[in-house]
């Protein structure tokens, strides 16, 4: 069965950045990476960036930069302007769409006593979607 | 709960111009759909597909508005447009927005999958 792998990773140089790395574990390829925090795609969640292998990516704010790390794996970079970090309690969602056979959604947070510069374990919660 | 909201329609002479908007919005949220369209219904027809436009910008356009229409969207203000150039009396009609998501972000055959709609705006081309 496909899964869906979350990082989130605070960087040690500069507390207010946080990159999220996803990956996607699984046979077939993919056609649509969809990053958004706050809950999953279309489920309460805010699109933070749209990655497609051929016609690119979009992104939006605090969202900085993303990109694609391999064929199946993608980070993106964001820049808290706030003095709070807020995006420290947030929940970040990756969904891998392999169309046409479905997509795959995980999410991830940074962990309450993460020192800055480590990672979160990947911790795959499968989210079976079949759009 | 996702909502639409048209706006710009309105009485316009053969020939002439408008422009509509519509912004999608919801609550709690920030809603960014994939596919973004715009559909018609002409007085006792049926429904039709005008244009719609993907999150990458990719376009598709019915054959009756080609280079008369344009469609666009501002993704930052979750806003899509359709300037409509050189109308004419067929072109009077109910247009509606309609929004959606897809497996691979692109627009979907015109009609197919999109699951959010606005309630409309009067077009209306008569001299």
């Known amino acids: 069965t496909p899964e869906v792998w979350v990082q989130v990773q605070m960087e040690a140089t500069e507390l207010s950045s946080f990159t999220v790395h996803c990956g996607f574990l699984g046979p077939g390829s993919i056609s649509l990476v969809t990053v958004s925090w706050g809950g999953p795609d279309g489920a309460g969640g805010t699109k933070l960036a749209v990655l497609h292998p051929e016609l690119g990516t979009r992104q939006w704010a605090p969202a900085r930069q993303a990109r694609w790390e391999t064929q199946s794996s993608i980070s993106l970079a964001l820049e808290d302007s706030g003095a709070s970090s807020p995006f420290a309690n947030t929940t970040f969602c990756c969904k891998f769409a392999s169309f046409p056979e479905g997509s795959w959604e995980s999410c991830g947070s940074l962990p309450p006593s993460s020192d800055p510069g480590l990672s979160a374990p990947p911790t795959p919660v499968p989210i079976l979607r079949a759009d | 709960e996702v909502q639409l909201v048209e706006s710009g329609g309105g009485l316009v002479q053969p020939g002439g111009s408008l422009r509509l908007s519509c912004v999608a919005s919801?609550?709690?949220?920030?809603?960014?759909?994939?596919?973004m369209a715009w559909f018609r219904q002409a007085p006792g027809k049926g429904l039709e597909a005008v244009a719609g436009?993907?999150?990458?910008?990719?376009?598709t356009y019915a054959d009756s508005v080609k280079g008369r229409f344009t469609i666009s969207r501002d993704n930052a203000k979750n806003s899509l447009y359709l300037q409509m150039n050189s109308l004419r009396a067929e072109d009077t009609a109910v247009y509606y927005c309609?929004?959606?998501?897809?497996?691979?972000?692109?627009?979907?055959?015109?009609?197919?999958?999109?699951?959010?709609w606005g309630q409309g705006t009067m077009v209306t081309v008569s001299s």
């Open positions: 436009i993907d999150i990458f910008g990719g376009t």
């Open positions: 919801a609550s709690g949220f920030t809603y960014r759909p994939y596919c």
């Open positions: 309609a929004a959606g998501d897809s497996p691979d972000g692109r627009c979907p055959p015109l009609g197919q999958g999109l699951n959010y």
